[in-house]
């Protein structure tokens, strides 16, 4: 059995040149003719040189999975899906996203250090001592309130709560 070159495919005991991206094999090569290729029909594609008898079906971006169509399928390129706003891609296969997750909401005591994008989750960071955050989409931790001379500190601030002051 012959070992075919990188851009050839085996037919019986013969090696045939592959079809170009955007095409599939219509007729395998013979003694006098090379591989006869045919363009991929609508909603199908081949992204690489190939020996496929049929083009691959274009991917569909499922809104129920949090996906939207970012780039339409062409004869040589699969559909590119992106996550809807507020979501990021959990499973990426090359340029194709299959599932999205909602961006993390930062918990109390943390702030948003880096906003989430279509392909990255939100990055949260702890509030420094002397500051607090209720969490959510807050990008800055707020400084604790300093009780005035006429007030008494009832409860010291934490990373998630402000100082509690009482009027005398």
């Amino acid at each position: 059995q012959p070992s075919c070159r990188q851009e050839e495919f085996l037919v019986g005991d013969e090696c045939c040149p592959m079809c170009n991206p955007g095409y599939h094999v219509k007729q395998v090569c013979s003694e006098h003719t090379g591989t006869v290729c045919a363009p991929c029909p609508p909603q199908t594609y081949t992204a690489h040189a190939n020996g496929l008898s049929k083009c691959l079906p274009c991917g569909v971006c499922d809104p129920d999975m949090g996906l939207l169509t970012w780039q339409e399928c062409s004869s040589w390129k699969d559909t590119v899906c992106r996550c809807i706003p507020g979501y990021f891609c959990e499973n990426q296969d090359g340029s194709h996203c299959s599932t999205c997750l909602q961006h993390t909401t930062c918990p109390p005591g943390q702030r948003v250090e880096k906003r989430g994008t279509h392909d990255q989750d939100t990055v949260c960071a702890d509030c420094l001592t002397g500051t607090f955050s209720l969490g959510g989409t807050q990008e800055e931790c707020l400084p604790w309130t300093n009780c005035s001379a006429f007030q008494q500190e009832v409860r010291r601030g934490t990373n998630s709560t402000d100082t509690t002051c009482s009027s005398q």
């Epitope: 050839e8 003719t33 290729c37």
Partner: antibody, heavy 115, light 108 residues
Framework: EVQLLESGGGLVQPGGSLRLSCAAS????????MSWVRQAPGKGLEWVSE???????NYNPSLKSRFTISRDNSKNTLYLQMNSLRAEDTAVYYC?????????WGQGTLVTVSS | EIVLTQSPGTLSLSPGERATLSCRAS??????LAWYQQKPGQAPRLLIY???TRATGIPDRFSGSGSGTDFTLTISRLEPEDFAVYYC??????????FGQGTKVEIK
């Protein structure tokens, strides 16, 4: 003796149309796939289109559906309808026997696209 | 599409000398490569197909070799009528068939 004689070339304005013909003789025309190949002045060869014996056709993707190949086996004639012509379509257009390799060629007809 | 690159662009030789023309494909075309000769003001003429088979009526001083991506056209002893432009063409994966940019063989 195989003979292929192209006609229909000439001067046409950008956006215009032309229909080229290729009269074949000396062989059983209906048994052969046929092709058009063009050559811009001073440049190399570029495959344009081919048509099988039964009439199914293929085109160079770069032509963006502006050209249509057809044949009339009863008249032993091959045609190329060219629409929305551009300056870059200026070339000698050859008809040739065969689909993928070209055993016999006509002498060509010159198409000039210019305003 | 498959790109064919011919070298050299021009070959300056004398009658009686040996000419070696090269054609390289951007990916494998198997043995499905043809060579054509074109003289000024004339249509191309098929010389070689299937990388190494001479077309009808072509003298045996013309020979072709190679497979995959590297091909050679050899003219063993140049005759005055051999000075012309030579094109390679692949039909390994088509459409589209593609041609090389040509090699001009000129008299030195």
């Amino acid at each position: 003796e195989v003979q292929l004689l192209e006609s229909g070339g000439g001067l046409v304005q950008p956006g215009g149309s032309l229909r080229l013909s290729c009269a074949a003789s000396g062989f059983t025309f209906s048994s052969y796939a046929m092709s058009w190949v063009r050559q811009a002045p001073g440049k190399g060869l570029e495959w344009v289109s081919e048509i099988s014996q039964s009439g199914s056709s293929n085109y160079n993707p770069s032509l963006k559906s502006r050209f249509t190949i057809s044949r009339d086996n009863s008249k032993n004639t091959l045609y190329l309808q060219m629409n929305s012509l551009r300056a870059e379509d200026t070339a000698v257009y050859y008809c040739a026997t065969g689909r993928w390799r070209f055993d016999y060629w006509g002498q060509g007809t010159l198409v000039t696209v210019s305003s | 599409e498959i790109v064919l690159t011919q070298s050299p662009g021009t070959l300056s030789l004398s009658p009686g000398e040996r000419a070696t023309l090269s054609c390289r494909a951007s990916r494998s075309v198997g043995k499905y490569l043809a060579w054509y000769q074109q003289k000024p003001g004339q249509a191309p003429r098929l010389l070689i197909y299937g990388a190494s088979t001479r077309a009808t009526g072509i003298p045996d001083r013309f020979s072709g070799s190679g497979s995959g991506t590297d091909f050679t056209l050899t003219i063993s002893r140049l005759e005055p009528e051999d000075f012309a432009v030579y094109y390679c063409q692949q039909y390994g994966s088509s459409p589209p068939v593609t041609f090389g940019q040509g090699t001009k063989v000129e008299i030195k």
